[in-house]
């Protein structure tokens, strides 16, 4: 499918706002430093030279590959070296090792300031005056921080963020109708921005197959009356998608989502019941709404898996005759009967067969020696079950904000050379499961819980990729994808760790601290809390318990002060003391 | 283990041709993508090009695009680069290298756990 010209083929077939959105998208991600308005002008003259490939597209330069196209455009800033250091190094590769080179330099930490949220009436006022410029902003901010947000889908979220102020702007309480929307929208950004690095960190780390493998397991489950082949290729296109959008191609991307939401649409009767609903919206929506339907009902009729993969005699022949297809069909049958389980559950125990067969069919008897293979499945499930069982029953009976402690401290013991604020971040999201998943039905639990805490555990290990520091977090994060989460649940207290000094500054607190949101406090407070267990890590729950309780009371006593700065001068002194006596 | 063995390098004329194989032996299988890198002397390994084992897609570094073409025979587990219009600067050590996972990054040496030994084309009058 060669076109002339591929801008050309790619404004024709996306069109002028959503081609201008996401090459602002993908110039935001690359170059995460630079100003808006340095943007919005190389997006202009980037869509003005398409528009001239589309009038003629044998017009100079029109057969140039996007990448060739897109990246001469990022060479042209003239802060590059400056702002970007090594990355102004890559303008000196050629195609397609200039475009790769850019991917690798993405920063999945930048250093750039939150986002404040101005006064309603501010941003009603903004939006009104240039509504065109206030989306961009929106796609440039959110894109910069998230250099791996899923791109046709960050244009949904624009679609919503316009909406939401088209009609909260005109409401008598613009507050009350807008606030609550902007929250949902920010939560929901991070989800899904946290979802789609886990999806392209499985395409960069470990794979084409990898990524496969937990497609086939999940659209399984989504799709349990569909057949394998029309699973195979579902899992096929969307494969190509995301390789596309993780590789910078966000165009082809969105455009190849567009074509699969429309053959989904096409074949619904061979695919599920559940996507009537989706296919009557239009695009952008259409396509969230696919990637988010609930799983459908599982065929009455099922026979016993081990008819096929235990009990037949040409187990071992049909293993090798196709490796990868006979294990692509084990792992849909079992997932198709199993929504249940975690995706992760479903490739380890993918995986532990491949495993048997790998053993057994080298055996002299090979059937004899996989007779047994479905019974080794059961430590498998029972781990993430009694993991799950145990961490909802400490989330109902502490809630979440002690949940998250009790996290913070696990995870510290566990990993203490990981900075703070990561594992702040890290440990608080972790502890976001509770409220997440343990409210579901036990059939809910497993999958809603497991799914998340690896999408979590990922950011972990990208932001330790960054800057390594521990070891046992590189071995977690490098050896096996979907081992990650019991790799890190298996860890213990790290006994070669040397102890972090005291420093009081650490415990230095002020008047401002009376000030903030109750988030922020809570931060303060478990950044405090990491900052105690890295100076004592054998120290005993209990022990924690009293220092965090003389905290919290300490910090409540001088929020009420009428000299606040004045008491925090005095009673912090005397509650770092306490603590220490109590530690020691 | 896989192991990876090429041929074909020599010495040819501007404008002539030449076509390296890659003969691979022990697990390859169908998620392997096979490459070629090369390195001139005193510069770094760079990507000339690379194809999926499964499903034949094929990139290209642009120097090479339109004169090189990558090809491979899965029956006898080789793999191919046909080198049409050489100039001086396509003088290098050419190596075949191995992705058995097909990771993201087809351009990244990094990526590739397998390698061959290197064979030297020389393009000069």
């Known amino acids: 499918d060669t076109h002339k010209s591929e801008v050309a083929h790619r404004f024709k077939d996306l069109g002028e706002e959503h081609f201008k959105g996401l090459v602002l998208v993908a110039f935001s991600q690359y170059l995460q430093q630079c100003p808006f308005e340095e943007h919005v002008k190389l997006v202009n003259e980037v869509t003005e030279f398409a528009k001239t490939c589309v009038a003629d597209e044998s017009a100079e330069n029109c057969d140039k590959s996007l990448h060739t196209l897109f990246g001469d455009k990022l060479c042209t800033v003239a802060t590059l070296r400056e702002t970007y250091g090594e990355m102004a190094d890559c303008c000196a590769k050629q195609e397609p090792e200039r475009n790769e080179c850019f991917l690798q330099h993405k920063d999945d930490n930048p250093n750039l300031p939150p986002l404040v949220r101005p006064e309603v009436d501010v941003m009603c006022t903004a939006f009104h005056d240039n509504e065109a410029t206030f989306l961009k902003k929106y796609l440039y901010e959110v894109a910069r921080r998230h250099p791996y947000f899923y791109a046709p889908e960050l244009l949904f979220f624009a679609a919503r963020y316009k909406a939401a102020f088209a009609e909260c702007c005109q409401a008598a309480d613009k507050a009350a109708c807008l606030l609550p929307k902007l929250d949902e929208l920010r939560d929901e950004g991070k989800a899904s921005s946290a979802k789609q690095r886990l999806k392209c960190a499985s395409l960069q780390k470990f794979g084409d197959r990898a990524f496969k493998a937990w497609a086939v397991a999940r659209l399984s489950q989504k799709f349990p009356k569909a057949e394998f082949a029309e699973v195979s290729k579902l899992v096929t296109d969307l494969t190509k998608v995301h390789t596309e959008c993780c590789h910078g191609d966000l165009l082809e991307c969105a455009d190849d989502r567009a074509d699969l939401a429309k053959y989904m649409c096409e074949n619904q009767d061979s695919i599920s019941s559940k996507l009537k609903e989706c296919c009557d919206k239009p695009l952008l929506e259409k396509s969230h709404c696919l990637a988010e339907v609930e799983n459908d009902e599982m065929p009455a009729d099922l026979p016993s898996l081990a008819a096929d993969y235990v009990e037949s005699k040409d187990v071992c022949k049909n293993y090798a005759e196709a490796k990868d297809v006979f294990l692509g069909m084990f792992l849909y049958e079992y997932a198709r009967r199993h929504p249940d389980y975690s995706v992760m559950l479903l490739l380890r125990l993918a995986k532990a067969y491949e495993a048997t067969l790998e053993k057994c069919c080298a055996a002299a008897d090979p059937h004899e020696c996989y007779a047994k293979v479905f019974d080794e499945f059961q430590p498998l499930v029972e781990e993430p079950q009694n993991l799950v069982k145990q961490n909802c029953e400490l989330f109902e009976q502490l809630g979440e904000y002690k949940f998250q402690n009790a996290l913070l401290v696990r995870y510290t013991k566990k990993v203490p050379q990981v900075s703070t604020p990561t594992l702040v971040e890290v440990s608080r999201n972790l502890g976001k499961v509770g409220a997440k998943c343990c409210k579901l039905p036990e059939a809910k639990r497993m999958p809603c819980a497991e799914d998340y805490l690896s999408v979590v555990l990922n950011r972990l290990c990208v932001l330790h990729e960054k800057t390594p520091v521990s070891e046992k977090v590189t071995k977690c994060c490098t050896e096996s994808l979907v081992n990650r989460r019991p790799c890190f649940s298996a860890l213990e207290l790290d006994e070669a760790y040397v102890p972090k000094a005291f420093n009081a500054e650490t415990f230095t607190f002020h008047a401002d601290m009376c000030t903030l949101s109750e988030k922020e406090k809570q931060v303060k407070k478990q950044t405090a809390l990491v900052e105690l267990v890295k100076h004592k890590p054998k120290a005993t729950k209990e022990q924690l318990k009293g220092v965090m309780d003389n905290f919290a009371a300490f910090v409540e006593k001088c929020c009420k002060a009428d000299d606040k700065e004045a008491c925090f001068a005095e009673e912090g002194p005397k509650f770092v003391a306490a603590s220490q006596a109590a530690l020691a | 283990e896989v192991q990876l063995v090429e041929s074909g390098g020599g010495l040819v004329q501007p404008g002539g041709s030449l076509r390296l194989s890659c003969a691979a032996s022990g697990s390859t299988d169908s998620a392997y993508r096979m490459g070629w890198f090369r390195q001139a002397p005193g510069k770094e390994r760079e990507f000339v090009s690379a194809i999926n084992w499964s499903d034949g897609r094929t990139y290209y570094a642009d120097s090479v695009k339109g004169r090189f073409t990558i090809s491979r025979d899965n029956s006898k587990n080789t793999l191919y680069l046909q080198m049409n219009s050489l100039r001086a600067e396509d003088t290098a050590v050419y190596y075949c290298?191995?992705?058995?996972?097909?990771?993201?990054?087809?351009?990244?040496?990094?990526?590739?756990?397998?390698w061959g030994q290197g064979t030297l084309v020389t393009v000069s009058s």
């Open positions: 290298a191995a992705d058995p996972d097909s990771r993201l990054y087809y351009t990244v040496p990094q990526n590739y756990d397998y």
